[in-house]
């Protein structure tokens, strides 16, 4: 699987999950989240050659098409597969609230 | 929806489904499919700005990150959303067989 266990410990050039830290204030311009100040969101990056964690029959066909037509703009793309929630603390007036923001952290990627 | 109805009749720059015809022999090197000789597979292409058919909370956050950090390599990607099957005819010996190849035709796209 193209997950954090494999991707963070390798120098994989192809589609893999990459490290990305997002600072809520600096990177998003958000002040409303009290805690955490930022989080390891990660992102997916890398080419999707034939036989590389291809998502569907279509992505397999497109990867094969791309092998035969390397200059073509039609190619599978490396996107999130498994996502995890992020617990946050924010304020409503003076009252702190704890919430889970769903689908916030990328754990693995796929070629779609 | 970023589907064929909208995308094929517009000059949309952002993520949309685009026309692509794949010839089984020429483009894939496949001789095993007897009919059809090729098909309109289509593909997804175009940037994914904030407020553009974003798939998850993560893709929205990443699009916002990208608006503030336009040079970053972390950005949502335009990928298939709705896929349709393709009926084909192939031979087993001298006997023709009809089969549905699932997830072969892109009908709409999303930013993931």
């Amino acid at each position: 699987a193209l997950d954090t266990n494999y991707c963070f410990s390798s120098t994989e050039k192809n589609c893999c999950v990459r490290q990305l830290y997002i600072d809520f204030r600096k990177d998003l311009g958000w002040k409303w989240i009290h805690e955490p100040k930022g989080y390891h969101a990660n992102f997916c990056l890398g080419p999707c050659p034939y036989i590389w964690s291809l998502d569907t029959q279509y992505s397999k066909v497109l990867a094969l098409y791309n092998q035969h037509n390397p200059g073509a703009s039609a190619a599978p793309c490396c996107v999130p597969q498994a996502l995890e929630p992020l617990p946050i603390v924010y304020y409503v007036g003076r009252k702190p609230k704890v919430e889970q923001l769903s689908n916030m952290i990328v754990r693995s990627c796929k070629c779609s | 929806a970023l589907d064929t109805n909208y995308c094929f009749s517009s000059t949309e720059k952002n993520c949309c489904v685009r026309q692509l015809y794949i010839d089984f022999r020429k483009d894939l090197g496949w001789k095993w499919i007897h009919e059809p000789k090729g098909y309109h597979a289509n593909f997804c292409l175009g940037p994914c700005p904030y407020i553009w058919s974003l798939d998850t909370q993560y893709s929205k956050v990443l699009a916002l990150y990208n608006q503030h950090n336009p040079g970053a390599s972390a950005a949502p990607c335009c990928v298939p959303q709705a896929l349709e099957p393709l009926p084909i005819v192939y031979y087993v010996g001298r006997k023709p067989k009809v089969e549905q190849l699932s997830n072969m035709i892109v009908r709409s796209c999303k930013c993931s």
Partner: nanobody, 118 residues
Framework: QLQLVESGGGLVQPGGSLRLSCAGS????????MAWSRQAPGKQRELVAL???????AYVDSVKGRFTISRDNTKKTMSLQMNDLKPEDTAVYYC????????????WGQGTQVTVSS
């Protein structure tokens, strides 16, 4: 339930100016990410400009240097100052608010028509 009401649209000559306003009610306005989106005939809605609760703004390339987005959390309003308007800016302009909790949701106003023509 968040409600958004736009105002300030109208007919203007090329090179002219307009100021769009959006008033919000029914939510903690101070935490939402606000944006202006527009839809020209036969086109999808596109992002024009956005502004976060921390006053960070971003613009689509075609309006950079001409449009300015701002917000006032105490008055629960957002505005878009549009200068040097071009015929291609003709569209229905929508106010959009994204609230991120408890689950992400986009709220849209009804829209205000902007027509740039001589």
């Amino acid at each position: 339930q968040l409600q958004l009401v736009e105002s300030g649209g109208g007919l203007v000559q090329p090179g002219g100016s307009l100021r769009l306003s959006c008033a919000g009610s029914g939510i903690a306005f101070s935490r939402v990410t606000m944006a202006w989106s527009r839809q020209a005939p036969g086109k999808q809605r596109e992002l024009v400009a956005l502004i976060t609760d921390g006053n960070r703004s971003a613009y689509v390339d075609s309006v950079k240097g001409r449009f300015t987005i701002s917000r006032d959390n105490t008055k629960k309003t957002m505005s878009l100052q549009m200068n040097d308007l071009k015929p291609e800016d003709t569209a229905v302009y929508y106010c959009v608010a994204t609230d991120w909790v408890p689950t992400r949701r986009d709220y849209w106003g009804q829209g205000t028509q902007v027509t740039v023509s001589s």
